[in-house]
Interface confidence: low
């Protein structure tokens, strides 16, 4: 299937002025009910999914003002193993808490240059950026 | 912090021609080792993360050629509860398999119109699009 090229403005439309950071209200792209506090190797009976998971994780902010989205959040596992559903605290070494990765499409703001090499505003350069989405309780691989 | 506006080309640079779907080779944005087959309510000891999870899931393709990324994958839980780490098969109703949602930044290709209303190529319209990333084994909420 087809892919898009980068998108670069010209002098014409939209103006370079428009490409400056605007203050268009866009909902923040942080995970719902994000809480950087009270995180430990335990599964809560309340709160957001990342704290109730038996493979609990916290979020780490990755901000780059020259990237779209500017804010990305990386999951960081709080436990090497899975937590007991019974107590919500002690671990079972038979289950591993593993990061789930995803190659997310992001765009970087790069200076554009016209045919004569002069600055022509900003281009959006498409990239794949690896983010960790969550921690998942898995059965360890059995090597055959 | 600041946000970007939509990015629309003009007649100038890049040309409308360039904005048609190009065949720039970009790695597909599907999850690693994606497997739509052999999926059931069990936790494997081998294979990708989504099949080894005790909250296993499959991926469902969501393709829109007027959206960037064109291909998104939605997780679909295979079990209502978590699977036993011991056997990898039977479920424990004390753990719920819940979808983890994320509002992903996507761009839709929309026709742009100049000041006089004439067609000026395509704009990229930024949107938040809800995708389910994975299924997570969680302790059920305790209602206080």
């Amino acid at each position: 299937y087809s892919h898009w090229p980068s998108c670069c403005p010209s002098k014409g439309y939209p103006s370079e002025e428009l490409l400056r950071w605007s203050t268009v209200p866009v909902p923040p792209l942080k995970p719902a009910s994000l809480d950087f506090h009270s995180v430990s190797c335990r599964a809560s009976e309340d709160g957001p999914l990342n704290s109730r998971a038996i493979s609990p994780w916290r979020y780490e902010l990755d901000r780059d003002l020259n990237r779209l989205p500017q804010d990305l959040y990386h999951a960081r596992c709080l436990c090497p193993h899975c937590v007991s559903l019974q107590t919500g605290s002690h671990m079972d070494p038979r289950g591993n808490s593993e990061l789930l990765y995803h190659n997310q499409t992001v765009f970087y703001r790069r200076p554009c240059h016209g045919k004569k090499g002069n600055h022509k505003g900003y281009c959006l350069e498409r990239r794949l950026y690896r983010v960790s989405l969550a921690c998942v309780c898995v059965r360890p691989r059995v090597m055959g | 912090y600041s946000h970007w506006p939509s990015c629309c080309p003009s007649k100038g640079y890049p040309s409308e021609e360039l904005l048609r779907w190009s065949t720039v080779p970009v790695p597909p944005l599907k999850p690693a080792s994606l497997d739509f087959h052999s999926v059931s309510c069990r936790a494997s000891e081998d294979g990708p993360l989504n099949s080894r999870a005790i909250s296993p899931w499959r991926y469902e393709l969501d393709r829109d050629l007027n959206r960037l990324p064109q291909d998104l994958y939605h997780a679909r839980c295979l079990c209502p509860h978590c699977v036993s780490l011991q056997t990898g098969s039977h479920m424990d109703p004390r753990g719920n398999s819940e979808l983890l949602y994320h509002n992903q930044t996507v761009f839709y290709r929309r026709p742009c119109h100049g000041k006089k209303g004439n067609h000026k190529g395509y704009c990229l319209e930024r949107r938040l699009y809800r995708v389910s990333l994975a299924c997570v084994c969680v302790r059920p909420r305790v209602m206080g």
Epitope: L85, T87 | C82, S84, R94, M143
Partner: antibody, heavy 121, light 113 residues
Amino acid sequence: QVQLQESGPGLVKPSETLSLTCTVSGGSINSYSWTWIRQPPGKGLEWIGNIYNSENTNYNPSLKSRVTISVDTSKSQVSLKLNSVTAADTAVYYCARTYNWNYEIGAMGVWGQGTTVTVSS
Amino acid sequence: DIVMTQFPDSLAVSLGERATINCKSSQNVLITSNNKNYLAWYQQKPGQPPKLLIYWASTREFGVPARFSGSGSGTDFTLTISSLQAEDVAVYYCQQYYSTPFTFGPGTKVDIK
């Protein structure tokens, strides 16, 4: 495959302390709940108590003043001490583990073969 | 303490026939928030330790033959052996693990008629 083996003196004098050890092999002693159950000759099963998280304990109120359950992770052993025994404490004593970490600590899926303790002078 | 009662005390069933054992708890062992009954069934053969058959009142333990099934909710529970086999001769116990002390029923002895 995890195995549990109870051990201890087969004969204990009245008023003395009964001390039993459950040795765990083929599996981790961490992350599980460990339970002691006893069965007097020709009778049913009686739950003595359990321990989880290496330190959290529950005891049967009928025995609470006399019983102590502990875990020694370095030796992979679970211990039972029962003070001031009488003839009524004569029984087969079993050590058991939760079936699996994510199941309720009351349902016991792995049992030792049991050890017979007779209280007599 | 929750008192568990079982009936009958003993029963004799022909090979291949159905055996039904009842268990009653003195108080509710169902937690409505997760819709789970905190009740297990065990089988004990002479000279052996008990073996877990059923937990959550109706979930069969891994490796337990399908002829064993559990049912019931709240305070009344049943263990059914759909087609009795010679190796099923044993004493069967129910146990609540809703609250400590976890208590067992007195047992039901199953023999072949």
